[in-house]
């Protein structure tokens, strides 16, 4: 056969469908690869051909469009299953061609099973709801094109194994599920089952999504730097390790990029000729507020390093903040000599205790990774 532009296996489109449910799958050529649509291609005399490779087989074979009750059919650029079977899993190819032109792409289709509580290997979309924000809705996804607008389906919503009925703050409203006010307890998987008739048969569409309740924009604040702060002085002798944590709290903000960085004498650490390492850790609250900690570490600090300015910076969509760490070189403790000896132990102990850092009144206590002597 003549040459064909082969776009290969489009693994970006990992299509998953439930067993024993209708599925309509559009040929990805017109979605992602070609600059014209099916109608244009059809009127230009191009034909769309479908074939498939079964799971764990290498042999490409035509799709059987002569199954009882037209179980598999093609309509324009859509491949229809009414309904799917488990062994429909495989790689499907759509090819657009005429005598002078050919283009094709393959994509994987996985038919998955679900249990009575709608658990399955299906990858679930996540819908974020703001905590205590007023009425918010989720909509039963990916049901367009399955039945005409003249057909009125029945829609049942579930949370896990349980039909959503008599819930305090969640109300099913057809294709929508309304949350009068969202709380942490509303986190979880929600399933809509759409039931519709077609040619004397009844079909079900099952769609599950994960609801995650997140911090409300009403409560969002600019980044808050908890450390460094005015209550902690980093006092070191040359040769010691300097460790300064920068701990920043970020309110949850939809699609916001949270950033934390250090500057040393106004420059990025990479642009300073000293051996600095920075380790970052990130933790999240239940409402996806974020705490980022970047620990700046200089293994063997010099007296020059102890004169530098160390500033922690943070930025989110709500604003930018910065805070300098108070770094000092330790002054050696004066050696007192008292006639008759003794009497200085307590004083030396006080200086020993303040060898690393000074904690001044109030303030948040953090676990700094310092060596306390």
């Amino acid at each position: 056969s003549e040459r064909c532009d082969d776009w290969g296996l489009d693994t970006m489109r990992q299509i998953q469908v439930f067993e024993d449910e209708p599925a309509r799958i559009k040929c990805p050529l017109f979605e992602h690869f070609l600059k014209f649509n099916y109608s244009t291609a059809h009127s230009a005399g191009l034909t769309l051909i479908w074939y498939w490779t079964r799971q764990d087989r290498d042999l490409e074979e035509p799709i059987n469009f002569r199954l009882p009750e037209n179980r598999i059919s093609k309509e324009k650029d859509v491949l229809w299953f009414r309904p799917t079977l488990l062994n429909d899993t495989g790689n499907y190819t759509c090819m657009l061609r005429n005598t002078t032109y050919c283009s094709k792409v393959a994509f994987p289709l996985e038919v998955v099973q679900k249990d009575s509580c709608f658990n399955s290997p299906m990858k679930l979309p996540v819908h974020k709801l703001y905590i205590e924000y007023g009425i918010q809705r989720i909509t039963c996804p990916n049901v367009d094109g399955y039945f005409p607008s003249s057909v009125k389906p029945t829609i049942t919503w579930y949370m896990g194994c349980y039909k959503i009925q008599n819930f305090n703050n969640v109300i099913p409203e057809g294709m929508n599920l309304s949350f009068l006010i969202a709380f942490i307890s509303n986190n979880g998987n929600y399933t809509c089952v759409v039931t519709y008739p077609e040619n004397g048969r009844t079909f079900h569409l099952t769609r599950t999504l994960t609801v995650k309740v997140v911090g409300s924009p009403k409560n969002a604040v600019p980044p808050v730097i908890h450390s460094p702060n005015d209550h902690v002085v980093y006092e070191k002798e040359p040769g010691e390790e300097l460790l300064i944590p920068c701990t920043v709290y970020f309110s949850f903000l939809m699609d916001s990029r949270n950033e934390v960085w250090w500057t040393i004498d106004g420059k990025k650490p990479d642009d300073i000729p000293i051996d600095v390492t920075i380790n970052e850790s990130i933790s999240h609250s239940r409402t996806e507020d974020e705490t980022r900690t970047q620990i700046l570490s200089i293994k063997k600090v010099t007296s020059e390093d102890l004169k530098r300015s160390y500033v922690c910076h943070a930025r989110s969509a709500k604003g930018e903040v910065a805070k300098a760490a108070t770094v000092k070189q330790k002054v050696p403790a004066p050696r007192y000599t008292v006639e008759g000896g003794g009497g200085t132990g307590g004083l030396n102990d006080i200086f020993e205790a303040q060898k690393i850092e000074w904690h001044e009144g109030g303030g948040h206590h953090h676990h700094h990774h310092h060596h306390h002597h």
Epitope: S116, M159, K163, Q165, N166, F167
Partner: antibody, heavy 122, light 107 residues
Framework: QVQLVQSGAEVKKPGSSVKVSCKAS????????IQWVRQAPGQGLEWMGY????????DYAQKFQGRVTITADESTSTAYMELSSLRSEDTAVYYC???????????????WGQGTLVTVSS | EIVMTQSPATLSVSPGERATLSCRAS??????LAWYQQKPGQAPRLLIY???TRATGIPARFSGSGSGTEFTLTISSLQSEDFAVYYC?????????FGQGTKVEIK
């Protein structure tokens, strides 16, 4: 370790009501459902209904609609089953049961209370 | 509602022997079936769910099989503590329904 502890045995007159409690200890943070099941003497198990304490959702078996009310007090991790218009055939052991989450297919009756005997007699 | 029918009503078995209990659903329940054990004066205990998955702490001598409408609970070698009443339950459709039970007694 999650446990369910039910209230003590009751003797009731026909036409009256009974309210059985079921207290959960060691409850997980995730929402869960409390089921109510009854067993008449020498008979099988009969599902009555459920409640999801943290979300308020509930449902009852058709047979008990209008006579049963299942409620919950989240602050004390206690669920209640009230059955009204009692008749002699309501004499049974009433059990509460639960799973760990709302999602465990087949494990919604994972943990059981010890049962409460309700005797309806004139 | 789905009716669950268990057979036999009573099964007499000697210790060490195999016991096979049957449960039939009035319509397909897929693999959404559980088995419970109940001893006199005690609450039921979950043995098997998903037709064949043993619950936590259940000995390997208990096994479940079947799907659709026909299910079996097998106790490979009966121990003295296994003499009890066994119930099947479907959780495919609301309302969830139980069978009437099979009593396994000492022969």
């Amino acid at each position: 370790q999650v446990q369910l502890v039910q209230s003590g045995a009751e003797v009731k007159k026909p036409g009256s009501s009974v309210k059985v409690s079921c207290k959960a200890s060691g409850s997980p943070a995730e929402p869960y459902a409390i089921q109510w099941v009854r067993q008449a003497p020498g008979q099988g198990l009969e599902w009555m209904g459920y409640i999801i304490p943290s979300l308020g959702g509930y449902d009852y078996a058709q047979k008990f609609q209008g006579r049963v009310t299942i409620t919950a007090d989240e602050s004390t991790s206690t669920a209640y089953m009230e059955l009204s218009s009692l008749r002699s055939e309501d004499t049974a052991v009433y059990y509460c049961a639960r799973g760990q989450t709302l999602y465990d297919s087949g494990r919604q009756f994972d943990i059981w209370g010890q049962g409460t005997l309700v005797t309806v007699s004139s | 509602e789905i009716v669950m029918t268990q057979s036999p009503a009573t099964l007499s078995v000697s210790p060490g022997e195999r016991a096979t209990l049957s449960c039939r659903a009035s319509q397909s329940v897929s693999s959404n079936l559980a088995w419970y054990q109940q001893k006199p004066g005690q609450a039921p205990r979950l043995l098997i769910y998903g037709a064949s998955t043993r619950a936590t702490g259940i000995p390997a001598r208990f096994s479940g099989s079947g799907s659709g409408t026909e299910f079996t609970l097998t106790i490979s070698s009966l121990q003295s503590e296994d003499f009890a009443v066994y119930y099947c339950q479907q959780y495919n459709n609301w309302p969830w329904t139980f069978g009437q039970g099979t009593k396994v007694e000492i022969k």
